[in-house]
């Protein structure tokens, strides 16, 4: 599923991401835009053999199990396929664990490079939330 901007904002708010661990909803929508272009089925292979999955491009080296990433930690205890669902519950639950580590949202390269320090509230402007 490819979400609309406001549709995703509403879904993320419903799943408890607004101000989760101090990160406003705009941060999460912005991250999703530049990680996956709002596409829940986005996958991208990395040079180390791991793969990033779903709307928040969660990595198989650390967070999920895809059966083909050597030494995967699977810290979210889920199959990576669960991160490709049109239901973003698994991606959000896992993202909450990721952001609860010391690096916060810096764990997402796209957030760090494209969203951090910008007017992220623009990503939810005009949305009925």
């Amino acid at each position: 599923k490819v979400f609309g901007r406001c549709e995703l904002a509403a879904a993320m708010k419903r799943h408890g991401l607004d101000n989760y661990r101090g990160y406003s909803l705009g941060n999460w929508v912005c991250a999703a835009k530049f990680e996956s272009n709002f596409n829940t089925q986005a996958t991208n292979r990395n040079t180390d053999g791991s793969t990033d999955y779903g709307i928040l491009q969660i990595n198989s080296r650390w967070w999920c199990n895809d059966g083909r990433t050597p030494g995967s930690r699977n810290l979210c205890n889920i199959p990576c396929s669960a991160l490709l669902s049109s239901d973003i519950t698994a991606s959000v639950n896992c993202a909450k664990k990721i952001v609860s580590d010391g690096n916060g949202m810096n764990a997402w390269v796209a957030w760090r490079n494209r969203c951090k320090g910008t007017d992220v509230q623009a990503w939810i402007r005009g949305c009925r939330l």
Epitope: G16, Y20, R21, R73, L75, N93, K97, N103
Partner: antibody, heavy 113, light 107 residues
Framework: DVELQESGPSLVKPSQTLSLTCSVT????????WSWIRKFPGNKLEYMGY???????FYNPSLKSRISITRDTFKNQLYLQLNSVTTEDTATYYC???????WGQGTTVTVSS | DILMTQTPATLSVTPGDSVSLSCRAS??????LHWFQQKSHESPRLLIK???QSISGIPSRFSGSGSGTDFTLSINTVETEDFGMYFC?????????FGGGTKLEIK
């Protein structure tokens, strides 16, 4: 299945340091986030802090600089240190997997002279 | 810190009744609310995560609802093994905090 087991002295004198160990079996502690939670007499629960897979620690500000959570990845053990204890620190101390799925059986620590 | 308030403090019910336990947060916490059961001399057991998400191995008579500041744990047809303490916990903002608990006791 994952099992957690707390151990340490059941009696600590005021002003001393409370030191507890949590031994984890069934999973590597580098594959998770691990918490220390305590329950006071009268049922109040307090989330003391946690340590992440990367070794990052988060401490409850109410415990200020008294608390330290560390780990030994080779022994697969977690440690809690609480300095300068008072009688108010008398509680049952639990280590738990961060998601709340797995808990130790708890160990009761009394602070008394 | 976010203050979690549980009501009532004690709930007296007869096995077979259906009950609702309330938990209120002092500020919005989205769906970042978890429910635990603790019986005497036992460790807490996770019943519901993220307000309404079920947990493997937990009987289906337990369900959760709510978002923002007001949350409810429902037990559909209470069984004798359900008596004990129930706690809610928020994980929206650090430090995570627990409610004071509701004691479910036999009438």
């Amino acid at each position: 299945d994952v099992e957690l087991q707390e151990s340490g002295p059941s009696l600590v004198k005021p002003s001393q340091t409370l030191s507890l160990t949590c031994s984890v079996t069934g999973d590597s502690i580098t594959r998770g986030y691990w918490s220390w939670i305590r329950k006071f007499p009268g049922n109040k629960l307090e989330y003391m802090g946690y340590i992440s897979y990367s070794g990052s620690t988060f401490y409850n500000p109410s415990l200020k600089s008294r608390i330290s959570i560390t780990r030994d990845t080779f022994k697969n053990q977690l440690y809690l240190q609480l300095n300068s204890v008072t009688t108010e620190d008398t509680a049952t101390y639990y280590c738990a997997e961060y998601d709340g799925t797995y808990w130790g059986q708890g160990t009761t620590v009394t602070v008394s002279s | 810190d976010i203050l979690m308030t549980q009501t009532p403090a004690t709930l007296s019910v007869t096995p077979g009744d259906s009950v609702s336990l309330s938990c209120r947060a002092s500020q919005s916490i989205g769906n970042n609310l978890h429910w635990f059961q603790q019986k005497s001399h036992e460790s807490p057991r996770l019943l519901i995560k993220y307000a309404s998400q079920s947990i493997s191995g937990i009987p289906s008579r337990f369900s959760g609802s709510g978002s923002g500041t007001d949350f409810t744990l429902s037990i559909n047809t209470v069984e004798t093994e359900d008596f004990g303490m129930y706690f809610c916990q928020q994980s929206n903002s650090w430090p995570y905090t627990f409610g004071g608990g509701t004691k479910l006791e036999i009438k």
